[in-house]
């Protein structure tokens, strides 16, 4: 079947990094500079992505694969394939329409991105606050009086923070 298909369509023999050149009797021509084809049998090569401005090149374009970008220091990637760059804030802040703003009392952010999240409510688990929260750190929950029996664990760390969604304000 492959043999039959290649007789019918000579382009199917063109490997990645080349294209089937209709102007030259459908022979396989190498992709021109700044272009690539990642699969065989292509009739055109795709233009390489250029990492300009706030984007910087993480991986150069080759004849068989597109360039990959990341963001300049002080920014982080968003979207599939780092389609956007978003500015970082400091820990203890979140990014809003008005720029980087400190977390409100009772919330924290231990990352340079994402939103401020409420401190863990220790009392919901019958615990007490062992270490107070800050803008940058969650509270640490300690034992309730009933837990202070011999052999009981004295500190319950808060649940690991998940990657937050992003809230504009």
């Amino acid at each position: 079947f492959e043999r039959t298909r290649s007789l019918q369509d000579p382009c199917s023999n063109c490997p990645a990094g080349t294209f089937c050149d209709n102007n030259r009797n459908q022979i396989c021509s190498p992709c021109p500079p700044n272009s690539f084809s990642s699969a065989g049998g292509q009739r055109t090569c795709d233009i390489c992505r250029q990492c300009k401005g706030v984007f910087r090149t993480r991986k150069e374009c080759s004849s068989t694969s597109n360039a990959e970008c990341d963001c300049t220091p002080g920014f982080h990637c968003l979207g599939a394939g780092c389609s956007m760059c978003e500015q970082d804030c400091k820990q203890g802040q979140e990014l809003t329409k008005k720029g980087c703003k400190d977390c409100c009392f009772g919330t924290f952010n231990d990352q340079k991105r994402g939103i401020c999240r409420p401190w863990t409510n220790c009392s919901l688990d019958g615990k007490s606050v062992l270490v107070n929260g800050t803008k940058e750190r969650d509270v640490v929950c300690g034992p309730s009086p009933a837990d202070l029996s011999p052999g009981a664990s004295s500190v319950t760390p808060p649940a690991p923070a998940r990657e937050p969604g992003h809230s504009p304000q």
Epitope: G53, L78, S83, C85, K97, P168
Partner: nanobody, 123 residues
């Protein structure tokens, strides 16, 4: 081709004014927030201001509030930064950038960047 081209930079004395322009092409300008950033010599990029698609919302970095005004003309596919009462610390390369789809609703990411225009404030 999607493109942003800044102009209007130059040398100005402290207390002076400049108006920067950013001409957009290759995309539907009126569908995007537009943002100004700047980079002072030896420093990182700093957000300056941004403006909503229809110009109805504008926000500024604290140090430029009351001195800088961002505006846009969707008929001319352009965004502007009027800079008054300029100070030495405003010396920087100024860039305009396009807010990506969903900007301000779910993120503040930019996806297209101009080449920059240099503003020097010096006596």
């Amino acid at each position: 081709e999607v493109q942003l081209v800044e102009s209007g930079g130059g040398l100005v004395q402290p207390g002076g004014s400049l108006r920067l322009s950013c001409a957009a092409s290759g995309f539907t300008f009126s569908s995007h927030w537009m943002t100004w950033f700047r980079q002072a010599p030896g420093k990182g990029l700093e957000w300056v201001a941004h403006i909503k698609e229809d110009g109805s919302e504008k926000y500024y970095e604290d140090s430029v509030k009351g001195r800088f005004t961002v505006s846009r003309d969707n008929a001319k596919n352009s965004v502007y930064l009027q800079m008054n009462s300029l100070r030495a610390e405003d010396t920087a390369v100024y860039y305009c950038a396009r807010g990506g789809d969903g900007y301000s609703d779910s993120h503040f990411g930019v996806d297209v960047w101009g080449q920059g225009t240099t503003v020097t404030v010096s006596s």
